[in-house]
């Protein structure tokens, strides 16, 4: 029977900047039961304070809800366990909200087929922020990234898209079942997960085009942008 | 209804002790952390002493520390101050109240009257 | 310990007056300032947080500003409800110090 080891705690997200949830890995429990606590102060300040909640984010976790989080604040935490040997203490972490932002996937992703008379057939997508973000106020600046495969395909396509909440793709394998998703991050912070898969069936008589991909920006008032392969590739993330 | 009641101020002599209560409702009190301030007649405000939530930490103003003990039962809502070795000046009204979580007493009770006086 | 020095310890001003009261802390504080408003026979109540953030339901006339050592609160126009006492107090470490306050009157 041994004191417990040193336990890490290895995350923090926030989905808004309004609150955030850390974890932590426990070290090795020493053949006793441990318990673990979590404090932590606010840099400038020596008011050492107690998790407020460690329910909400699951085991092994501390969530900081709307009144525990200041956006203008860096935290200092660290992790106690605690057996009937001894205690141990994870390093501190320190931890900025604006830096630790994941948001919640992108919402209401639609996918249509266009056609246009005069004009070379396109996929046109379009989707909305996570509900949690609150664009208006500028403290965000949401990136879109989208990423499509035929259904039996093993590989995707990935296609940065800026600040935009719509998209345009040329060259697409014609008759195929394509599977769309978008997800999202801030300027400073993580991408979200995917977004929930949309299906899209392309039409047989999709006209082919390997050799560009059109992008439209509802920035710029609908005017297209021709972007080739290679200046894509600059945008491919990963 | 977020609310704070003091109770257990009363008239004692010089070296006699007192516990005053304070019950919390209308918030999670275990979530929160708790502090005791006083104001002496026609006086500033002084802040007497705080508890972390589950009551592992716990800070005292330098006039009370070893005299004054601060603890809570968050089963009960409630807040306490052990006060011992009372002086006359410790006459005041007492409050409790809650730290927010950014730090800052923004619930108060009404107060409790301590008065110490051979 | 840090003290925390309030000034003026009292003034006299008219209705709509603009008025400032002052905060000094010893060592710098970040901006771990709150003031608070006393009115006669009442408890304190929360009106600035953070050094500048008004609390929800406080008047707009209402301001703080500052950082470090050097804090002000201003009442843009006096009103005859702003009779009080004034605390500044910071929160940054034990102990929980409040400056002496400013007793506030009209004219």
């Known amino acids: 029977q041994l004191p417990p080891g040193k336990p890490e705690i290895f995350k923090c997200r926030s989905p808004n900047k309004e609150t955030f949830t850390c974890w932590w890995r426990p070290g090795t429990d020493g053949g006793l039961p441990t318990n673990y606590s979590l404090t932590y102060h606010r840099e400038g300040e020596t008011l050492m304070h107690e998790c407020p909640d460690y329910i909400t984010g699951g085991p092994n976790s501390c969530h900081f809800g709307k009144q525990y989080t200041s956006m203008w604040r860096t935290y200092v935490m660290m992790v106690n366990a605690t057996n009937q040997m001894g205690s141990s203490f994870s390093d501190e972490l320190y931890v900025d909200v604006t830096y630790i932002v994941q948001p919640d996937p992108p919402l209401e992703l639609t996918v249509e087929v266009k056609q246009p008379e005069d004009r070379k057939p396109y996929l046109w997508m379009k989707w909305s922020p996570p509900t949690l973000i609150d664009l208006k106020t500028g403290w965000f600046t949401l990136l879109y990234e989208i990423r499509l495969k035929p259904e039996k395909a093993a590989e995707w396509e990935t296609h940065f898209a800026g600040q935009q909440t719509e998209f345009k793709i040329l060259s697409l394998h014609p008759g195929q079942k394509y599977l769309v998703q978008v997800r999202c991050k801030p300027d400073h912070g993580y991408w979200s997960a995917w977004s929930p898969a949309t299906f899209i069936q392309i039409p047989s008589d999709f006209i082919m085009n390997d050799e560009q991909k059109l992008i439209s920006e509802e920035d710029l008032g609908g005017e297209q942008k021709l972007i080739s392969e290679e200046d894509l590739h600059h945008h491919h993330h990963h | 209804e977020v609310q704070l009641v003091e109770s257990g101020g009363d008239l004692v002599q010089p070296g006699e002790s007192l516990r005053l209560s304070c019950t919390a409702s209308g918030f999670t009190f275990n979530s929160y952390e708790m502090n005791w301030v006083r104001q002496a007649p026609g006086k500033g405000l002084e802040w007497v002493s705080y508890i972390s939530s589950s009551g592992g930490t716990k800070y005292y103003v330098d006039s009370v520390k070893g005299r004054f003990t601060i603890s809570r039962d968050n089963a009960k809502k409630s807040l306490y101050l052990q006060m011992n070795s009372l002086r006359a000046d410790d006459t005041a009204l007492y409050y409790c109240?809650?730290?927010?979580?950014?730090?800052?007493?923004?619930?108060w009770g009404q107060g409790t009257m301590v008065t110490v006086s051979s | 310990d840090i003290q925390m020095t309030q000034s003026p310890s009292s003034l006299s001003a008219s209705v709509g007056d603009r008025v400032t009261i002052t905060c000094r802390a010893s060592q710098d504080i970040f901006n771990y300032l709150a003031w608070f408003q006393q009115k006669p026979g009442k408890v304190p109540e929360l009106l600035i947080s953070?050094?500048?953030t008004l609390q929800s339901g406080v008047p707009s006339r209402f301001s703080g500003s500052g950082s470090g050592t050097y804090f002000t609160l201003t009442i843009s126009s006096l009103q005859p409800e702003d009779i009080a006492t004034y605390y500044c107090q910071r929160y940054n470490s034990a102990p929980l110090t409040f400056g002496g306050g400013t007793k506030v009157e009209i004219k």
């Open positions: 109240a809650r730290l927010n979580g950014v730090d800052v007493f923004d619930i």
């Open positions: 953070a050094a500048s």
